[in-house]
Structures are given as C-alpha cells and as structure tokens.
C-alpha cells in the first residue's frame, strides 16, 4: 500500500504570520455571492481556499493563493525562488500522486519526481495530499527545476482546455466519463451584474443529485437544476433567495423602469 508522508506541518517559514490580519479567521461576510478566495489559516499555517460572499469580511482575504502566501507566510518568496533555482524543493513535492477519497473529476497538477516535471492528474475533490496544484504554473514555480527541464516534451498545452468560471474542463473524457463543456455565453447588453450570473446551468462532474438554483439571464428568474456535487460553475446557489439576491440586482429592464431589485 502507498502510505503518504505526513503533510500536516507548516508549509514554509516560521509560525508567526507577517501581518496581524493574517491571524484573522476567514470571514465570508453577510452577502451570498460565491467567490473563490484564499485566507491564511493560523491553525495549519497554510493559505487555504474559502468562499467569500462578496461584501464586508476582513483583510485576511486574497484573490490568489500566491498573493496570500506572499503576504502571510514569512520567507515564502525566498523559498519559492530557492525551489525554482533547484536549490531546495518543499518536501511535499516528493509525495506520490493521491487522488483523494472522493471521486469528483478535477484537473490538477503534481510534481513527478521520476520525470522531474509537473504533470496533470485527476483529483477527486477531497483530501489527498499537498502535491496538488491548481495550475501548471504554480506547480512549476514551487516544485520544478527549470534547469532540468527548460521545455518539457509532454508539457500540457493550455489550449487543450476550456476555462469556465473557476473550473478548467478538459475537452476529452476523464475515466471514461465525457466531461461537459459549458457553451460560451455572450454578455447581454441589458445585464450589468456579476459575470457568472450569465453562465448556463452546469450540473458538474460527479454523480450526486443535489437541488440547486441558477440565474437565467434571459428570463431574469432563478430556476432549479440538479447539481451532481462537484465541478460546474459559479452560477450555482443553494437557495432561490440567494440566487436572486446575487444576480437579479444586475438586470436592467429598460431605462424607464430602472433596476429590478
């Protein structure tokens, strides 16, 4: 059996965060948008993902993982530079591929110590280990040594992907399951709200059947759809009320009527 090394230790640097706000708890705020953000977790000493509601909250919130790490992890940039120069890689770069306990289909990247390259793998959506990166670039920056592989032969071409909201969806099949692609939706002239409210309902890539709501920009209403439990896009709300609050305010019916609340 493949036993994973412990990966619960502090990722980089000392235990003391660089700024006081890095010690604040993740605060999703009172609004109900679903914006992927990152915060520094004082318990794990890592930057982690959370869903931001779109308003209020606190300063421990970053748009990118990189920004969070730079801001809150002491010595992060120095360590990242060391890794890139081949001097030293974090231990987790040497962990074996672990798809995790769950069986969603999420495109991720890991460092392969045999080939000395970052490669694509399918992550199940929960647990696993820290040799798991959202982008090829992030994987390369932290784990790959450019001296060994200036231009890897089997480097994944980003043109093989369709980027939709927060998910990167392969055109091909994953584990014999055809992965859906969300059609590109033109931005409507009469809609001035959040861009993900224009995306079509996307049931995702798993096998559950969960009741969710999406905003239909043509009708200006929120409709029910079945969500399979992972993947999909941000036009996905747990209640009709949240859906309307998040998306309906952007609908401009015409100049005389103004904005529909």
């Amino acid at each position: 059996l493949s036993e994973e090394a412990d990966d619960t230790d502090s990722e980089l640097g000392s235990m003391k965060p660089l700024h006081t706000f890095c010690a604040m708890k993740a605060d999703d705020g009172p609004c109900k948008a679903m914006i992927r953000s990152y915060f520094f977790n004082m318990y794990t000493h890592q930057c982690e993902e959370f869903i931001y509601g779109g308003c209020e909250g606190n300063e421990n919130r970053f748009d990118t993982l990189e920004e969070c790490k730079k801001t809150c992890i002491p010595g992060y940039e120095k360590t990242a530079v060391k890794a890139a120069s081949g001097a030293e890689r974090p231990d987790f770069c040497f962990l074996e591929e672990d798809p995790g306990l769950c069986r969603g289909y999420m495109k991720r990247y890991l460092y392969n110590n045999q080939t000395k390259q970052c490669e694509r793998f399918v992550y199940g959506g929960c647990l696993g280990n820290r040799n798991n990166f959202e982008t090829l670039d992030e994987c390369k920056k932290i784990c790959e040594n450019p001296v060994h592989s200036p231009s890897p032969v089997n480097e994944v071409q980003m043109s093989d992907y369709v980027t939709d909201g927060n998910t990167v969806t392969d055109r091909s099949t994953v584990n014999n399951i055809v992965v859906p692609q969300s059609p590109k939706v033109p931005r409507r002239r009469d809609y001035r709200g959040r861009p993900w409210c224009l995306q079509p309902a996307d049931s995702g890539l798993c096998k559950a059947s969960e009741r969710r709501f999406y905003y239909n920009s043509a009708t200006g209403k929120c409709h029910r759809f079945n969500y399979t439990g992972c993947g999909g896009n941000n036009n996905n709300f747990t209640t009709r009320r949240r859906c309307l609050r998040s998306c309906k305010t952007g609908l401009i019916k015409n100049k005389s009527k103004g904005v529909v609340k």
Partner: antibody, heavy 123, light 112 residues
Framework: QVQLQQSGPGLVKPSQTLSLTCAIS??????????WSWIRQSPGRGLEWLGI?????????RYAVSVKSRITINPDTSKNQFSLQLNSVTPEDTAVYYC?????????????WGQGTLVTVSS | DIVLTQSPLSLPVTPGEPASISCRSS???????????LNWYLQKPGQSPQLLIY???NRASGVPDRFSGSGSGTDFTLKISRVEAEDVGVYYC?????????FGQGTKVEIK
Amino acid sequence: QVQLQQSGPGLVKPSQTLSLTCAISGDSVSSDSAAWSWIRQSPGRGLEWLGIIYKRSKWYNRYAVSVKSRITINPDTSKNQFSLQLNSVTPEDTAVYYCARWHSDKHWGFDDWGQGTLVTVSS
Amino acid sequence: DIVLTQSPLSLPVTPGEPASISCRSSQSLVFRFGITYLNWYLQKPGQSPQLLIYKGSNRASGVPDRFSGSGSGTDFTLKISRVEAEDVGVYYCQQYTSYPLTFGQGTKVEIK
C-alpha cells in the same frame, strides 16, 4: 445493499496485537468508488477515526497520527474484506471498534457501518 | 487537527417540537461551489452511527425530510423540524476538509 460484518476477539492483553476483520458484501474492497475505514468509540474520546484504505490506480492508506506507529489496515481482495491490526495495545485502546465504508461517488461520507466490536484491553 | 465543537451536549426535546444542534469548526469547511466538507450522523441507542446529512445540507437516502443541514464557513446547524420519538440518540458532525478526519463530541437528544 452493502453489509459490513466484523469479527475478532473481544479481549486482548496489554502489549499484544489487536486484530479485527471486516467482511464486505454488496460491494468490493477494490471498488474505486469507495474507501474502507476503521473508527473507534470510547466514553473518554468519542468517535475517533483511525485510518482508511482505498484503491484508485493503486492502493492508498492514511492513518491518524495518534496511532500511526502501531496501525496497519490491509485489504484482502480474495476474501473481499479488510483488516485492522493495532500493535502494542494498552488499556487506553479499550473501545468499540467499527469498520465503515466511505462512499466516494455520491455521499462523500461513511454511509455503511459494521455492527461494532467491543475490544477490552486487560490482563 | 480540525476541532469540531458541538452544542448543546444534551438536548431534551418534546415530540412534535423543533430541535437544533450547532457544530462549530476551528477552520473553514467550505470548498468551491458551495460544497461543504461536513457530514452529520445519528447514533441511536445500541446501534452503529448512520449517515444523515452529507456535504452540509444533503439528506442521505431514506432520511426523513424533517432533518435538514445548513451553515457555511465554520458554523453549521442540524435542524429537526418536528422531533419524533425515534429521533433520540447521539448526533455527531464530521469534517473531511483535511486529515485526520474528525468528529464532534456528540449531542445527546432525549425526550423530555
């Protein structure tokens, strides 16, 4: 309908090895849509997850740090079962031990449990 | 380790009345698209635990619709809209954001 049937001794002497088996019916230990776990329950510690195994492209295991140096969970594909071995037991290991299936596809949770085995560590 | 703190630890209920159990996590359990890495289980007297709610708010098969799960970030709630006599037992929340998988200490629901 998945069923998990536990077997093993209820009394183990201190410093010896606790061994339990969980026989699976209605699913396969090698299924790529499940994972197989041991969890124990004692009055002092509540429900405590001990470890898990799962097969994807190969077998994986993860163990709780509290027992990592003493625990082994192994699959037995020929008998469609999995086992728990906990070495060097002390009275602290006295608990009801459960095997459980983690549903990897739909529920993402422990949706089937064995009947539980009370293991007492005493001389 | 992620610590889950349940409250109350004991909850006397009247049949037909609503009940609510809280589970607070030491760190966020929400992933993208509103997936919450939190489950709820019920352990009836003398039985093994059974899955009630998965991914924060989804009822497992065969679970009556009087049970509902909600919450986000670090604060989660299990609600029973109208308690029935068969609902007595100990309720546990459980997280799977990171290893080790951890459970709350349990809330014992009993009839008044």
